[in-house]
């Protein structure tokens, strides 16, 4: 017998401009009259339209869901029943042709065509997109809380919240021909379970999203999203029942910028300037293509591209690319989003220089992408340290801490976390290196202390970017540096005039002068150490719920000693600002560093100053002994202590703590403790301070308290945010 | 490179002293505990003692409790075992070895130097 | 007679696999980490595995340790000539107060 044929729906969505009408204020209101009567006509006509051409025989429904400007603007969807094999065959671009094709045919006949009777259509303005039972579904939810806004030239539009007894609310917003809408979401609460999905259609068409975002999001408070043009749906589900709005939903049209760019660089290395896509920090648009091609000064040198959080990958398959699509000499790499910095060396092998194309491939975007570009010397890309090929960063070697995953950089190491003399190869512990006494067979230890010398991992770089041999030489009262950088800033880590950490002992008043203790409504969270006179560092998982987000709910003390009594010397203070490291990881405990303004600067006094922070180079050598300090749990899942308490601990190699946690232990942790456990860190010493006396007597911050298994476990030592990995991004901040 | 150099061993006659040192270099000196362990010849390792790096603790084995004192001078980067009222029993090759705090793992050893106690 | 108990001597031809067993107590094994020292005649010990089944840098993969209670065991894969030594395993004994040894095993490569 015959096989009967399968049908299948296929769902369109789309929009057509009528030429003899004018968009009223009314036809905003669903409920209104004027929507009601004008969605009849406009109904009829596209039935009738879809009728008159071949599409007539599958035609099913369809529907007139909105109006917008230009003069009158309909917005609709319907669906044709077709047969499966013709499927492909129906495409968005075929059904919109034929339609136009209808259109044009009827443009300047006098017959009478049913669906001219009212509406004057005009064929250019027709756009047919591909949609799904589902994206109907989808607008079909919100359209009991329906918004259309058109937004003028030069008008900045802020959206009316959503309405909080609808489930789903859709702002269908409409800007000038030309322009691209700009739309920023700006999250107004600490907690909240709202999502918002961005569409570069009028309505909520997945294949057309630019991007969703969810729950008030720490990590983008402020969302800026591009659309391709001046058309642009926002569709909001809601959380949590909430009275107050978690969010502020602003709208402007922006003209298209170009994103091309023809540079010719100098003759020196280093980052040289920044390309980025249009409107950044704004997410790129899903139109999005950057052209910009640079021209490299001499074969020498390659031409750098350094990321901040993107990284270019290969892509097997073709494959599109979801994140950006880059073209740098005719390779096609991949973009990818990632909490790490990276680099994109590119070679230069002719003086004709390097095209770098950007396309958003897909209608899916993100954050914007910003890109430092300099030059690197093709023959020595990284003086004095390594580099990494995983990333293309130039990275510390031999220094005991495996910063290239691939752990090249710590590999045929003649001397590791030592200095090696120039006349054997031994190797010599690094406190002994410039310190007066030669140690080498012929004291190649102690010479060219007193000059600049080429930069490597353990020497220390000036202000005026030279670099000096003797190691950890800030603040020990002597300059070595030409221009005194290194005795710059100095006034830090000394402890007070003083006469419970698992293990540890009480400590005294000014003791451990920048010690600080952050608490909610009176309850000690968290450590932490003053650094500055308006900032304190501490740990970021300690912010880690949403609950804990907000900065008006903490207080800072320093100069406190016992948490249930105050005494002269403690002050307190409001935070201001709250910044976690943008590449911080929470399941990781990667980049585990926050940094708290606080609302007045300190006065110093015995019992508050701050610590000195390391510089990139200073290196904490394995086997030093410092110390920890805080009110944490004297025992594992006990109550906190109520005196500050200290306790020493030793600096563990590298490579011996990530083999005891298998391998989590990353650059930026560094492992302190006992094999036989006893002495550690315990809940409540989070984001304290583990520091480590100089030969000077100033007192340097190592690390935080970050993570570990269980408090004063044998086998396990604490694991402690690595401050010199992190010192860039202080620096940056807290100048 | 770490290395331990032992010196100070002889034969002695029982009831006597005697006093070994062990010479460090190639690391920092002062952030280590060190210990010393012993092997009589032909027989199994023996720990002897252990002085914590800033010399807050000493243990000794029972054995040796009341005779032997072990010292350390971290200006020198020398380690010291005291050895008095030798017995014959402590004849042996003594190494000196270092160990990270609170792990009681000897990572690196010295040659070792034999004391001999014989009359 | 040592605190750890460890098998004299054990023997296995080329390339084959040995095991060096150690048991021991609470106090000891039990509670705490241990390591296993290697002693080619003539010369000082070399740490082989510390923290119950870690490698020092170094050391070949061919030796593992593992641990399981108070028995501590010391294995090694692809036997050599050089391998041929003495294999002490040690521990903290928390009630003694010190470093405990095992009698030492000597290992022949036939």
């Known amino acids: 017998g015959y096989k009967a044929e399968v049908m299948v729906s296929q769902v369109y969505s789309g929009s057509l401009r009528v030429l003899n009408r004018h968009f009223s204020q009314d036809l905003t209101r669903r409920e209104s009259s004027a929507f009601r009567s004008e969605t009849a006509k406009a109904q009829k006509m596209l039935k009738e339209l879809i009728t008159s051409t071949r599409l007539g025989t599958y035609y099913n429904s369809s529907s007139v869901y909105s109006f917008g400007e230009g003069p009158l603007t309909c917005f609709f969807w319907f669906i044709l029943q077709i047969p499966e094999h013709r499927r492909l065959m129906l495409s968005p671009e075929v059904v919109q042709a034929l339609l136009v094709e209808e259109l044009l045919s009827t443009v300047n006949s006098s017959a009478a065509v049913p669906y001219r009777a009212e509406y004057e259509v005009d064929p250019e303005g027709l756009v047919i997109l591909e949609a799904s039972v589902k994206d109907i579904a989808a607008l079909n939810s919100t359209l009991g809380c329906y918004r259309y806004s058109y937004v003028g030239q030069g008008q900045v539009l802020r959206l009316k919240g959503p309405d909080h007894l609808a489930s789903s609310c859709l702002w269908h917003l409409q800007g000038p021909k030309d322009l691209m809408l700009k739309l920023r979401l700006e999250w107004t609460l600490a907690e909240c379970r709202d999502r918002l999905a961005m569409y570069d259609v009028a309505g909520p068409l997945e294949k057309r999203l630019i991007t969703s975002v969810y729950g008030c999001s720490r990590q983008e408070p402020v969302v800026e999203v591009l659309a391709s043009g001046a058309i642009m749906a926002v569709v909001w589900k809601k959380g949590l029942h909430s009275y107050y709005d978690p969010f502020v939903l602003s709208v402007q049209p922006v003209v298209f910028q170009a994103c091309e760019v023809n540079l010719t660089l100098d003759n020196r290395l280093d980052s040289q300037g920044v390309l980025s896509t249009p409107y950044f920090p704004s997410y790129y648009s899903p139109q999005t293509h950057c052209s910009w091609h640079l021209t490299v000064p001499s074969l020498d040198y390659g031409l750098a591209l350094w990321f901040d959080a993107y990284a270019l990958r290969r892509q097997k398959y073709d494959l599109p690319c979801t994140q950006g699509q880059w073209t740098i000499q005719n390779r096609r790499l991949c973009g990818l989003r990632i909490l790490q910095p990276y680099a994109e060396r590119i070679p230069v092998v002719a003086t004709a220089g390097i095209t770098i194309n950007f396309t958003s491939q897909i209608s899916l975007t993100g954050p914007g992408v910003r890109v430092h570009y300099g030059l690197y010397n093709q023959s020595d890309p990284c003086p004095g340290e390594f580099l990494c090929s995983v990333n293309g960063l130039c990275v510390p070697a031999c220094d005991g801490v495996k910063d290239c995953p691939n752990g090249l950089d710590e590999r045929n190491c003649v001397c590791r976390a030592t200095f090696q003399c120039k006349e054997d190869s031994t190797c010599i512990s690094l406190p002994k290196v410039c310190d007066g006494q030669p140690d080498c067979l012929n004291g190649s230890d102690e010479e060219q202390c007193q000059e600049g010398v080429p930069c490597g991992t353990f020497t220390f770089q000036c202000e005026d970017r030279s670099c000096v041999k003797k190691p950890n030489p800030q603040c020990d009262g002597r300059p070595d540096c030409r221009d005194g950088s290194d005795e710059e800033h100095c006034d830090c880590g000394l402890q007070g005039p003083s006469s419970r950490i698992v293990g540890g002992a009480v400590s005294s008043e000014g003791e451990w002068p920048w010690q600080a203790s952050l608490q909610v409504r009176g309850r000690h969270i968290c450590g932490g150490a003053l650094i500055a006179d308006r900032w304190v560092i501490t740990a970021a998982h300690c912010f880690q719920e949403d609950s804990m987000a907000s900065t008006v709910l903490w207080t800072v003390f320093l100069g406190k000693v016992w948490q249930n009594s105050r005494w002269p010397g403690e002050v307190s203070f409001k935070v201001s600002r709250l910044l976690l490291h943008p590449y911080h990881e929470e399941d990781s405990h990667d980049y585990d560093v926050a940094l708290l303004q606080l609302d007045h600067p300190v006065v110093r006094s015995a019992a508050v100053r701050p610590v000195c922070l390391p510089a990139r180079s200073h290196f904490f050598e394995p086997g030093l002994h410092c110390w920890i300090t805080g009110w944490g749990a004297l025992r594992e899942g006990g109550p906190i202590s109520n005196a500050l308490q200290k306790v020493d601990v030793q600096l563990i190699p590298q490579d011996l703590c990530s083999e005891v946690y298998r391998y989590q232990v990353t650059p930026r942790m560094l492992c302190a403790g006992y094999r036989k456990g006893k002495k550690d860190a315990c809940q409540g010493d989070s984001g304290g301070p583990l520091v480590c006396k100089a030969l000077s007597g100033r007192w340097f911050l190592a690390g935080l308290v970050s993570w570990g298994l269980g408090c004063g476990r044998p086998n396990y030592f604490g694991v402690y945010t690595r401050i010199t990995g992190v010192i860039s991004w202080i620096q940056q901040v807290v100048t | 490179q770490v290395h331990l150099v032992e010196s100070g061993g002889a034969v002695v006659q029982p009831g006597r002293s005697l006093r070994l040192s062990c010479a460090a270099s190639?690391?920092?000196?002062?952030?280590?505990?060190m210990h010393w362990v012993r092997q009589t010849p032909g027989k199994g390792l023996e720990w002897v003692t252990i002085i914590r790096y800033d010399e807050t603790n000493i243990y000794y084995t029972e054995s040796v409790k009341g005779r032997f004192t072990t010292s350390r001078d971290n200006s020198k980067n020398t380690l010291y075992l005291q050895m008095n009222s030798l017995r014959v029993e402590d004849t042996a090759v003594y190494y000196c070895?270092?160990?990270?705090?609170?792990?009681?793992?000897?990572?690196?050893w010295g040659q070792g130097a034999l004391v001999t106690v014989s009359s | 007679q040592s605190v750890l108990t460890q098998p004299p001597s054990v023997s296995e031809a080329p390339r084959q696999r040995v095991t060096i067993s150690c048991s021991g107590g609470?106090?000891?094994?039990?509670?705490?980490?241990v390591n296993w020292y290697q002693q080619v005649p003539g010369k000082a010990p070399k740490l082989l595995i510390h923290y119950d089944d870690l490698l020092p840098s170094g050391v070949s993969d061919r030796f593992s340790g593992s641990k399981s209670g108070t028995s501590a065991s010391l294995a090694i894969s692809g036997l050599q000539s050089e391998d041929e030594a003495d294999y002490y395993c040690?521990?903290?004994?928390?009630?003694?107060?010190?470093?405990?040894f095992g009698g030492g095993t000597k290992l022949t490569v036939l």
């Open positions: 070895a270092r160990g990270w705090t609170g792990s009681y793992v000897f990572d690196y």
């Open positions: 040690a521990a903290w004994d928390d009630s003694l107060n010190g470093v405990v």
């Open positions: 609470s106090s000891n094994i039990g509670n705490n980490a």
């Open positions: 190639g690391f920092t000196f002062s952030n280590f505990d």
